[in-house]
């Protein structure tokens, strides 16, 4: 297993609809044809897997059907979007990139993106 640098933004604020997007960029040392991207969430020293996808260069990322993540790839950049977020989902979201093929296997883990989620205020009652 060889190490690889992964860069991602330090902070992202989710939209009022609970959607957060960020770019995960990796420094590929070779010409990988199969890349696996995993998003991990770290909160209160607990790390959980949010979503994962393997893509072949030139194709879109394919997440599980019930995944809260979507994404696109362009070269060594992955544009990730996480939806359905609520205030309780605020935390550090870490991008993990694995170059699966061809050998050798490379692994890179970003420093994480702190995603802040603020639940929208309920609309006040209307007299109309």
């Amino acid at each position: 297993c060889k190490a690889m640098h992964v860069a991602q933004p330090a902070v992202v604020l989710a939209s009022s609809r609970g959607i957060a997007s960020f770019v995960c960029e990796y420094a590929s040392p070779g010409k990988a044809t199969e890349v696996r991207v995993t998003v991990l969430r770290q909160a209160d020293s607990q790390v959980t897997e949010v979503c994962a996808a393997t893509y072949m260069m030139g194709n879109e990322l394919t997440f599980l059907d019930d995944s809260i993540c979507t994404g696109t790839s362009s070269g060594n950049q992955v544009n990730l979007t996480i939806q359905g977020l609520r205030a309780m989902d605020t935390g550090l979201y870490i991008c993990k990139v694995e170059l699966m093929y061809p050998p050798p296997y490379y692994l890179g883990i970003g420093n994480g993106t702190q995603i802040y989620v603020i639940d929208p205020e309920p609309c006040p009652d209307s007299d109309f």
Partner: nanobody, 117 residues
Framework: AVQLVDSGGGLVQAGGSLRLSCAAS????????MAWYRQGPGKERELVAS???????AYTDSVKGRFTISRDNAKNTVYLQMNSLKPEDTAVYYC???WGFGDYGSWGQGTQVTVSS
């Protein structure tokens, strides 16, 4: 893991066509992606074409407009239609199935394609 069986290779003259098939032992509908790689004499294995679960396709530049990848989920089979073949397409062609959720996927055994000039 799903087992893959490649077939359809053979000897063909330049300009001819071949259709490769990759039959899977189980359902391919949930696979992240399926692809064809090839390895020419003295060369590294290279990605030729891929197709995702959603049907998105991608091709290496040298085969664009000549090769077409497709999948038939009902038959659990992936195809590579190769037209206008060139001598430089000579290689062993391997089918590849990719999961991506804690699995490295599967390879077919390979099928030889030889294009004579």
């Amino acid at each position: 893991a799903v087992q893959l069986v490649d077939s359809g290779g053979g000897l063909v003259q330049a300009g001819g066509s071949l259709r490769l098939s990759c039959a899977a032992s189980g359902s391919i509908s949930s696979l992240n992606a399926m692809a064809w790689y090839r390895q020419g004499p003295g060369k590294e294995r290279e990605l030729v074409a891929s197709i995702t679960r959603g049907g998105s396709t991608a091709y290496t530049d040298s085969v664009k407009g000549r090769f077409t990848i497709s999948r038939d989920n009902a038959k659990n089979t992936v195809y590579l239609q190769m037209n206008s073949l060139k001598p430089e397409d000579t290689a062993v062609y391997y089918c590849r199935a990719v999961w991506g959720f804690g699995d490295y996927g599967s390879w077919g055994q390979g099928t030889q394609v030889t294009v004579s000039s």
